[in-house]
């Protein structure tokens, strides 16, 4: 922590300017007025501070404000939004999109992920849901922000909002994301033809329960292996050969690249062999012909 | 990372003139500004002049008129100009460069070069 000293009378400061740059830690720390640097907070990211004076002003600020900073403050924080820390973050209710624009701008490139993804959080619990323009927020200037968001935060898009969501913006998301995604967007999609809805659900199938992956296979999609690959295991293992081969139509070959890799290995293992054989990939791993497939989980749900 | 390498110090007569430079290398991308520093026997390290990316300066109070900073962009290279020099400007000067973004943002520091104003 920065040692108190009073302040020298020619060193008293009576607004933020650049002379402060000359000013030592201890300078800083006794000469400058916590309310004068939230009241000129704008002006602070334009003066050329050393991280280490940066360091000072945060501890003004947050002695100033020890439950959080106000969002006049927050909106005007610039680089030293790089200082904050996801506890810091957790103190602070945003509801303005322009602060939430401005502080991604600052962290672009940073490794800032839990502070990014704790501001995001601050932002949807003070807007009260996660709504179309605060989604046209995230996906223009911060692709990929949106699955830094948990579940239960997820579970406020309203399906209307769905269609501003682009692939991009869920190559991070998780299962548990797509779990409470997927719903939503096949509600957003439902009146969409057949090949016009498989393009707009692909993204979000990591979601799908196994009866609207079967449903998908009637309907000659040609699912490409990099979406197979992302389906739920769960949803993947109860599907037939047949059926595999009619979701993946001409893309069905990638099924021996993806070989030894789940959910394609575990689902192997679920086939008869001479199933397996009829698709011509030389598959390995199916149950053998003349074996007794025993389901014991049924068993012992019913004991 | 970010490198920075001064050179130009060495002995001087009172009122004399030095140059000294400074040349950044590696991350070199986003600084935002350089500036240059002293230590001189038995003190803290000072800040003698500051320019920023958009070429505005700033001078102590101690050697405003007699130092003058300017950057070359192009070069990654800040210069400092000091005229009418004192004994009491003797020091190891120092340049800092700092980042504000990626991919390594905070402040950057030379290994120093020894200037001595004595008769």
């Known amino acids: 922590d920065v040692e108190r000293t009073t302040c020298p009378p020619e060193k008293e400061v009576h607004e933020i300017d650049e002379s402060l740059i000359f000013y030592k830690k201890r300078e800083l720390e006794a000469c400058v007025d916590a309310a004068l640097l939230a009241a000129q907070m704008d002006r602070v990211d334009a003066i050329p501070f050393t991280y280490e004076q940066l360091d000072v002003l945060k501890h003004k600020l947050d002695e100033l404000y020890p439950q959080g900073y106000p969002e006049s403050v927050i909106r005007h924080l610039g680089h030293l939004f790089l200082k904050m820390s996801p506890e810091d973050i957790r103190k602070w209710n945003v509801t303005s999109l322009e602060t939430l624009k401005a502080l991604l701008k600052v962290s672009k490139g940073h490794e800032m992920s839990a502070q990014v993804a704790t501001l995001i959080d601050r932002v949807v619990v003070g807007r009260g849901q996660l709504d179309k323009d605060t989604v046209d927020t995230l996906t223009a200037f911060c692709p990929g922000c949106l699955c830094s968001l948990s579940p239960e935060r997820l579970s406020s898009v309203p399906p209307s909002v769905i269609g501003a969501v682009r692939p991009q913006d869920l190559d991070t998301c998780g299962p548990r994301q797509l779990d409470v995604l997927y719903p939503k967007a096949r509600l957003a999609f439902q009146n969409m033809s057949g090949s016009e809805y498989f393009v707009k659900i692909r993204p979000f199938l990591g979601g799908a329960p196994t009866e609207d992956v079967k449903a998908l296979s009637q309907q000659n999609v040609s699912m490409d292996l990099a979406t197979f690959m992302k389906l739920r295991r769960e949803a993947v293992l109860p599907l037939t050969v047949a059926e595999v081969q009619k979701l993946l139509g001409p893309h069905v070959e990638g099924l021996k690249v993806e070989e030894q890799h789940s959910p394609v290995r575990d689902w192997i293992l679920k086939q008869r062999q001479d199933d397996l054989d009829t698709l011509g990939l030389g598959l390995q791993g199916g149950i053998p012909n003349g074996y007794l497939i025993l389901d014991l989980s049924v068993r012992e749900a019913l004991s | 990372q970010l490198q920075l390498v001064e050179s130009g110090g060495g002995l001087v007569q009172p009122g004399g003139s030095l140059r000294l430079s400074c040349a950044a290398s590696?991350?070199?991308?986003?600084?935002?500004?350089m500036g240059w520093y002293r230590q001189g026997p038995g003190n803290e390290r000072e800040l003698v002049a500051v320019?920023?990316?958009?070429?505005?300066?700033s001078y102590a109070d101690s050697v405003k008129g007699r130092f003058a900073i300017s950057m070359d962009n192009d070069k990654h290279t800040v210069y400092l100009q000091m005229d009418s020099l004192k004994p009491e400007d003797t020091a190891v000067y120092y340049c800092?460069?700092?980042?504000?973004?990626?991919?390594?943002?905070?402040?950057?520091w030379g290994q120093g070069t020894q200037v001595t104003v004595s008769s």
């Open positions: 320019i920023t990316d958009r070429g505005r300066a």
């Open positions: 590696g991350s070199v991308n986003s600084i935002t500004a």
């Open positions: 800092n460069a700092h980042r504000r973004t990626w991919p390594h943002p905070g402040d950057y």
